[in-house]
């Protein structure tokens, strides 16, 4: 008789999850010499230990502490790029501008990017059928708690000018309920961070509006100013040209507004 299994509303653990995490860890540590000391088997054991045999709606930041410790990595604090709802462009940017880092350019972020995982209370099984959905089931699920933990710590590490890439095509360009709006904004340290500079990425070819005047951007400016951090905003009207100019800044067409 098959054992009764909790049915959650979200997709189950990504197939071949253990192999994927281990392979990503090995690849990352091979590419990044400063992380060569990391024992990837220990990293996987710590990752697994955070959620295996635990109720997937009762995960805490403390559960991830052993993994956080093994993944400790010094990121240049003045080279941090945050993003909200525009991950692909942010990653394309840091692939070109190699001295800047998104969270997914760190070992911990790279390990978990685009993956889903959860376990079951009192069994050592990984649940490949379903995992809790943040809205429909519970917020303290393994994936959400992981991203909240690493996002908070990533924001805490930032200093000087912090950049954030925002999606100008969305109805809420700045969303208070996003990870950026609910976690990262509130964990920037005013003693270290002088300015948050928002880059609003336009979607339409003919879109010449100043999206820095959008009410949600004004809301972000208000939140940031109240935290004694300066705020600035730039429109990126042509993201394709923007990336091209990052690659080839000497190009004559790159002196005009992008």
């Amino acid at each position: 008789v098959p054992r009764w299994r909790q049915q959650w509303s979200g997709p189950g653990t990504t197939k071949r999850f253990p192999e994927t995490v281990l392979a990503r860890c090995v690849k990352y540590t091979e590419i990044h010499p400063e992380m060569r000391h990391v024992d990837c088997q220990s990293v996987w054991d710590a990752f697994k230990g955070a959620f295996i045999s635990k109720h997937p709606c009762n995960i805490t930041e403390e559960d991830y502490q052993p993994l956080m410790k093994l993944g400790t990595q010094t990121v240049p604090c003045n080279k941090i790029l945050l993003w909200s709802r525009i991950k692909d462009l942010a990653h394309q940017f840091t692939q070109v501008q190699r001295d800047m880092f998104t969270l997914e350019d760190t070992l911990l972020g790279y390990l978990a990017d685009d993956l889903t995982w959860c376990g079951e209370f009192n069994t050592s099984k990984i649940n490949y059928q379903s995992c809790p959905d943040w809205r429909k089931d519970c917020s303290n699920n393994p994936v959400s708690v992981f991203w909240k933990t690493v996002s908070r710590r990533f924001a805490e590490a930032a200093c000087d000018v912090v950049h954030v890439m925002l999606n100008g095509s969305r109805s809420k360009i700045f969303d208070k309920n996003s990870t950026f709006g609910s976690v990262e904004v509130h964990n920037l340290q005013p003693e270290k961070v002088q300015t948050l500079e928002a880059w609003v990425i336009h979607g339409g070819r003919e879109d010449s509006r100043d999206l820095c005047q959008d009410p949600t951007i004004k809301e972000l400016e208000s939140i940031i100013s109240k935290r004694n951090i300066q705020f600035s905003c730039k429109n990126i009207y042509r993201p394709d040209k923007f990336l091209q100019c990052v690659k080839n800044p000497e190009d004559s067409s790159c002196t005009s507004e992008i």
Partner: nanobody
Framework: QVKLQESGGGLVQPGGSLRLSCGAT????????MGWYRQAPGKQRELVAE???????NYADSVKGRFTISRDNAKNTVYLQMNSLNPEDTAVYYC??????????WGQGTQVTVSS
């Protein structure tokens, strides 16, 4: 930059007690792990005890039941209460603070000598 300052070391007789303190100053953010390490002459630095921001602790087998680590998050200070000290505990004791994306910070060390 975070600076760590240890205090409380000294000379103590076998069986005696000491309490070490370590305060973090500078640009303080939410330090995740704080802990104590020690290095005896001619030996490698080893973990004595550590404590997470949430209060979970971890001890070296050799000090379990004798040493207690505690932490005051508001003061960014970590303490090490050392009881039933023996000559093998003689070492320089170093404070460590770590943040996941800012790296690891070390104090200058404080000497603990256990001798009659």
């Amino acid at each position: 930059q975070v600076k760590l300052q240890e205090s409380g070391g000294g000379l103590v007789q076998p069986g005696g007690s000491l309490r070490l303190s370590c305060g973090a100053t500078g640009i303080i953010f939410s330090i995740n792990d704080m802990g104590w390490y020690r290095q005896a002459p001619g030996k490698q630095r080893e973990l004595v005890a550590e404590i997470t921001r949430g209060g979970s602790t971890n001890y070296a087998d050799s000090v379990k039941g004798r040493f207690t680590i505690s932490r005051d998050n508001a003061k960014n200070t970590v303490y090490l209460q050392m009881n039933s000290l023996n000559p093998e505990d003689t070492a320089v004791y170093y404070c460590n603070a770590a943040h996941t994306f800012s790296g690891s910070f070390w104090g200058q060390g404080t000497q603990v000598t256990v001798s009659s």
